[in-house]
Amino acid sequence: IPVIEPSVPELVVKPGATVTLRCVGNGSVEWDGPPSPHWTLYSDGSSSILSTNNATFQNTGTYRCTEPGDPLGGSAAIHLYVKDPARPWNVLAQEVVVFEDQDALLPCLLTDPVLEAGVSLVRVRGRPLMRHTNYSFSPWHGFTIHRAKFIQSQDYQCSALMGGRKVMSISIRLKVQKVIPGPPALTLVPAELVRIRGEAAQIVCSASSVDVNFDVFLQHNNTKLAIPQQSDFHNNRYQKVLTLNLDQVDFQHAGNYSCVASNVQGKHSTSMFFRVVESAYLNLSSEQNLIQEVTVGEGLNLKVMVEAYPGLQGFNWTYLGPFSDHQPEPKLANATTKDTYRHTFTLSLPRLKPSEAGRYSFLARNPGGWRALTFELTLRYPPEVSVIWTFINGSGTLLCAASGYPQPNVTWLQCSGHTDRCDEAQVLQVWDDPYPEVLSQEPFHKVTVQSLLTVETLEHNQTYECRAHNSVGSGSWAFIPISAGAHTHPPDEFLFTP
């Protein structure tokens, strides 16, 4: 660590005095201190001498000696007072800038330590300090305003009592800057805009920050727009607003608009798209297939996306039949707005009943006209089966009728013994009917098919079973010949009928 001679922490001299400060280190040494006149610097190897033969109040300050080659960065300091009866203060700065909540050091250096008891800090023109101003004083460094606030940005003077009167320093301007957390906050409204050619439009770009030093502009397709700026201050924030008013829009006004704001912390930007159209439009679409198949008893949500400008004047869901004249309950219809020009409409159909199959239409209207989107809903049913014994063209025939949706497939089984249902061990013969006769097939209804099994002689200790299946389930009917005639058995667990 360098050593300073004289080896005292502070030195008090009178104006005009000769002062010599010598610093010695192991290697070369350097002096630093406040910018002040009249010093002469002599350096010689490991020592450096600061001297003046005409000290003035402006030489008051702390002089520090460092050894640049010292890895520990040690230093030594001495404080010099040049006590001028006419100049109690040496002010080292015109202005002090700090951030809010930092300590602000106003560098009024007292030229005579004896005056310390009578010092005070005031605002210029003798005005008192603002309430809650917490400050302290150091004769070496000056006044410190602790945790400075933006509102304390003022012009200050340091005051000392000399011979019963207050002597003021020159003024120091304190600027307390707001801590800027980042680039200005931005809003650009609307987020999206559609207008018919000839209509009026407004786009508003606004930015706000705790600090007034920021810029904001609105650009259209990368061209900066010249728009008058409105400025405001509220909620402790500065606001700058740019409003673009278009009385009659045309196609050249369409495109991308960006609101850009920047400050020392960086830049923020946000964009929106402006569409100009020739006339009103109304588009309906669905991500779902318009032909829906659902198992009876299950639920379904029908969703329609609507894109429209101007806004909708009316909309509803309608049941077009064929089963009844019932209409969807309003409580089952739901509308959500994705944004200004896009909406989603949902019709919830819980626990579907047979009478609810059919066509559902969503209708919407705006100044562009009516549009409709129609869903066709078919219900799926597991097969229902029945078997009867009859004679066709003089031949004994088993006749199996199966009804369900989708169209059921039919299989005949012959098995030994009397049973409600053939199991694998009992099966004697299996016939698949690839092409059963379709008896009825109407839209939204079950499909009924008929399969014939010609039997020359009914074996009395055997069972004939008709099985039908589709993608929903299966059904069967067992036919047991008895000596008195024929006996039929539907399965024990008969199909659920909604």
């Epitope: 630093d32 201190g33 910018p35 009249h38 202005e95 002090v96």
Partner: antibody
Framework: QVQLQESGPGLVKPSETLSLTCTVS????????WSWIRQPAGKGLEWIGR???????NYNPSLKSRVTMSVDTSKNQFSLKLSSVTAADTAVFYC???????????WGQGTTVTVSS | EIVLTQSPGTLSLSPGERATLSCRAS???????LAWYQQKPGQAPRLLIY???SRATGIPDRFSGSGSGTDFTLTISRLEPEDFAVYYC?????????FGGGTKVEIK
């Protein structure tokens, strides 16, 4: 070895505010004065002002009304703002360590700022 | 403010020759507060001399400074190829700090 690096936008529009930052590396910003100097193309050097690590500032009177400086010791940075710029403010801007008895002993490499619409 | 006037504006010399650059102040400058800087194209200025006559760290001894009051001189005893540049004087004793207009030392 103390090094300085200026940073900021290279293009500023007339009437806007020029903002530059100088980052000090290889040493502490504390206990020193730090100056900003500018140099228009093909011309001499002009001192803008200096700031001490505590925030004390002295400005060149010719620019004082438009200049603000600040220091952030936590980031080892000091900054310059020059408001209401015109084409005449187009220059290379330098930051430098400014020592009472040695002059400006360490300089940044400079950053060119053009004022144009 | 103190105005510094440098002369000549341009000095055309050959390598090996002696260069003498002048800096005149509009009012007295304490010799402790006069510096000389060298600037090459596209580079920042570099401190050569402080306190009118003290060489900064790493500066060759062919560079020397002298003078007091209002007249100061920078001398380059034998010009090396790397010395061809613009040289500025600066006073740092009074605010505002001021620079001279510069002297360009070019190869003849």
């Amino acid at each position: 070895q103390v090094q300085l690096q200026e940073s900021g936008p290279g293009l500023v529009k007339p009437s806007e505010t020029l903002s530059l930052t100088c980052t000090v590396s290889g040493g502490s910003i504390s206990s020193y004065y730090w100056s900003w100097i500018r140099q228009p193309a093909g011309k001499g050097l002009e001192w803008i002002g200096r700031i001490y690590s505590s925030g004390s500032i002295n400005y060149n009177p010719s620019l004082k009304s438009r200049v603000t400086m600040s220091v952030d010791t936590s980031k080892n940075q000091f900054s310059l703002k020059l408001s209401s710029v015109t084409a005449a403010d187009t220059a290379v801007f330098y930051c430098a360590r400014d020592r009472a008895f040695y002059g400006m002993d360490v300089w940044g490499q400079g950053t060119t700022v053009t004022v144009s619409s | 403010e103190i105005v510094l006037t440098q002369s000549p504006g341009t000095l055309s010399l050959s390598p090996g020759e002696r260069a003498t650059l002048s800096c005149r102040a509009s009012q007295s400058v304490s010799s402790s507060y006069l510096a000389w800087y060298q600037q090459k194209p596209g580079q920042a200025p570099r401190l050569l001399i402080y306190g009118a006559s003290s060489r900064a760290t790493g500066i060759p001894d062919r560079f020397s400074g002298s003078g007091s009051g209002t007249d100061f001189t920078l001398t380059i005893s034998r010009l090396e190829p790397e010395d061809f540049a613009v040289y500025y004087c600066q006073q740092y004793g009074n605010s505002p700090l001021t620079f001279g207009g510069g002297t360009k030392v070019e190869i003849k």
